[in-house]
């Protein structure tokens, strides 16, 4: 293993725990991390006498580095002494050395927060002769803070007489500021705002960011839509390219393919905002199979502005798949809005995020623009899930009481859908509900042709429905009652249901 | 742009032993928490371990706990997964996996690589 310097951490006590007529106290301080042996641990204990100990390094298994732990046992007057902890260790270099210092108990506390600011750029986008940055150390327990600013981990001699603390309830905040010369702050080095704060040290780091590209404008490459790709068949990403400012010159969007095959051709459109920027789009059908099979599509942005070209990429998802769970509801009638209702669409455990989501009345799909559906979010262990919400009139669930919520993903199957029917008023055409449970699937057939699952309105039967015990030539559970549909003129439509 | 790419799955017999690698490229490796993910066939995704930034801190999934260990070595770019005393139920493919955000549990991760195939039967 290679030379490693260790991280020093001071051990205390919570001060609600020692009593308050305590003689002596011990405190500890543990270095961690470091290779090879030794380290050397010693205190600085002021005034007061104190007797140490140092136990044996001891290795942390996965490393195979060493860590040790040093302790102090003060007596007398120590309730308000501090006390350094210094580890050197000399293999890191002859003069490494970390100093702790902290005192014999820690107060429950609130820790800061850091976080560094940093000046804007000057209107045409370029740096001003001096940047600054102001680190902000928010939200603490009152108490004494030691603010340092580091550049590249190099303490800087800073006058930090200007830091101005305020108190907003029981919480303090401070902050401080560094004036840099645009020369130092284009160099690429770092800065550090280091607060030590009860004994522990907090900190935020800026530094000049990278050109990867060019200032203010902004490239994004989406994946086709699972509609448009399995139901549709007809799949296309988008290059969006935004806030372009308007010039002369022209834009290109410039599409290629990893495995050089030729592209289609693309369409293209320019929009001018109302912030005066520019967004360009362009649009390029893919095929259904290139996708799948995982093609790699490329769109590269040019322009005689922009010092470089802005390339993006995007191909298929990678990682496990899973189909989703889709769960439908209408909420209760609310007072003063009886003519409306809510439908909500749960959608759920998918692997990955990629879904599209309708609504359908009548076996017609309803336009986008009358649902509203959220992006996609982690469940943290278990995929992805989406809440999609349609507001229906009472025109149409009198005219039709039965929407389908559909998810269309890739790792469904058979055909990448998932639906799930949902009723305004579930059950109530036949009387009142009753409050068994609607069997998991309901079966339908007329005749010998076997149809699709469907709907039992709850758990009672439809009005056109008797009951009856049973028939011998239903193909469902015996445990079941079976309701035959005498409708005019058809064959009957016979479906369990509990009666 | 992050790539991860798996190797060294394969055909072998209950019992069996298997070292998964990841390169990565791309990103800072050392600065993120890594993980593998399976899927066995017609099975949901299941997340198998992770490991910290620094390879101190590790966590497996209940079922290989004792059998698999989850190793990095960050000068390399490289995630390791030891697999021992295999088992027919380890077929899967697995993925190495990372996280903008959180990797060091069962989580939907935001880069995957494209997966190597173990197959344990006899």
């Known amino acids: 293993a290679s030379t490693q310097s260790p991280s020093v951490f001071p051990l205390t006590r919570c001060c609600k725990n020692i009593p308050s007529n305590a003689t002596s106290v011990t405190l500890g301080c543990l270095a961690t991390g470091y290779f090879p042996e030794p380290v050397m641990v010693t205190w600085d204990t002021g005034s007061l006498n104190g007797t140490t100990m140092t136990l044996p390094a001891t290795t942390l298994t996965l490393s195979g580095h060493y860590a040790t732990i040093s302790l102090l046992t003060v007596s007398g007057a120590w309730a308000k002494q501090m006390f350094t902890c210094r580890v050197a260790h000399t293999p890191s270099s002859t003069d490494w050395v970390d100093n702790k210092t902290f005192s014999v108990c820690s107060r429950d506390f609130t820790p800061p927060t850091v976080k560094i600011l940093q000046s804007s750029c000057d209107g045409g986008g370029h740096f001003p002769p001096t940047i600054q940055l102001l680190c902000l150390v928010s939200g603490y327990t009152p108490g004494t803070i030691n603010i340092t600013w580091l550049e590249d981990g190099q303490v800087m001699d800073v006058d930090l007489s200007t830091a101005s603390t305020t108190q907003e309830g029981e919480l303090a905040s401070t902050q401080s500021e560094l004036t840099l010369s645009q020369k130092h702050w284009l160099s690429d080095r770092t800065y550090t705002c280091q607060v030590t704060y009860q004994g522990h040290t907090f900190e935020d780091s800026t530094k000049k960011c990278a050109d990867s590209n060019p200032r203010g404008v902004s490239a994004y490459l989406s994946r086709p839509s699972p509609f448009d790709l399995f139901i549709r068949k007809s799949p296309t990403i988008t290059c969006l390219v935004v806030d372009l400012a308007p010039s002369k010159g022209t834009v290109n969007l410039t599409w290629s393919r990893a495995s050089g095959k030729p592209v289609n051709h693309s369409t293209r459109k320019e929009e001018k905002q109302r912030n005066g920027t520019l967004t360009v789009t362009s649009t390029l059908p893919v095929g259904t199979r290139d996708w799948i099979e995982g093609e790699t599509y490329q769109c590269r942005v040019t322009h005689p502005h922009l010092p470089r070209a802005l390339m993006r990429s995007t191909t298929k998802t990678s990682g496990p798949r899973a189909a989703p769970e889709v769960y439908a509801f209408a909420t209760p009638e609310w007072p003063g809005s009886r003519d409306k209702r809510t439908l909500a669409c749960l959608i759920q455990n998918f692997m990955p995020e990629d879904i599209s989501v309708q609504w359908l009345h009548n076996e017609v799909q309803l336009p986008d623009a009358r649902h509203s559906t959220t992006q996609p979010r982690k469940t943290k262990g278990s995929g992805f899930f989406v809440f999609s919400r349609l507001e229906v009139t009472r025109a149409e669930w009198e005219q039709k009481d039965e929407f389908i919520c559909r998810a269309v993903h890739e790792a469904a199957s058979p055909s990448q859908t998932v639906q799930r029917a949902v009723s305004v008023n579930p059950g109530l055409a036949g009387g009142s509900a009753q409050s068994q449970r609607a069997p998991d699937r309901v079966l339908c057939h007329s005749g010998q042709q076997q149809g699709l699952p469907r709907a039992a309105g709850g758990s009672v039967p439809h009005p056109r429905c008797h009951c009856g015990a049973g028939r011998a030539d239903w193909p469902g559970p015996p445990e079941l009652d079976v309701c035959v549909e005498e409708a005019e003129g058809e064959a009957p439509w016979t479906w369990t249901g509990l009666c | 742009e992050v790539q991860l790419l798996e190797s060294g799955g394969g055909l072998v017999q209950p019992g069996g032993s298997l070292r998964l690698s990841c390169a990565a490229s791309g990103f800072t490796f050392g600065n993120y928490d890594m993980a593998w993910v399976r899927q066995a066939p017609g099975k949901r995704p299941e997340w198998v371990s992770s490991i910290d930034t620094g390879g101190d801190i590790t966590h497996y999934a209940d079922s290989v706990k004792g059998r698999f260990t989850i190793s990095r070595d960050n000068a390399k770019n490289t995630l390791y997964l030891q697999m021992n005393s295999l088992r027919p139920e380890d077929t899967a493919v697995y993925w190495c996996?990372?996280?903008?955000?959180?990797?060091?549990?069962?989580?939907?991760?935001?880069?995957y690589g494209q997966g190597t195939l173990v197959t344990v039967s006899s």
């Open positions: 996996a990372t996280d903008e955000e959180y990797a060091l549990g069962p989580n939907e991760f935001d880069y």
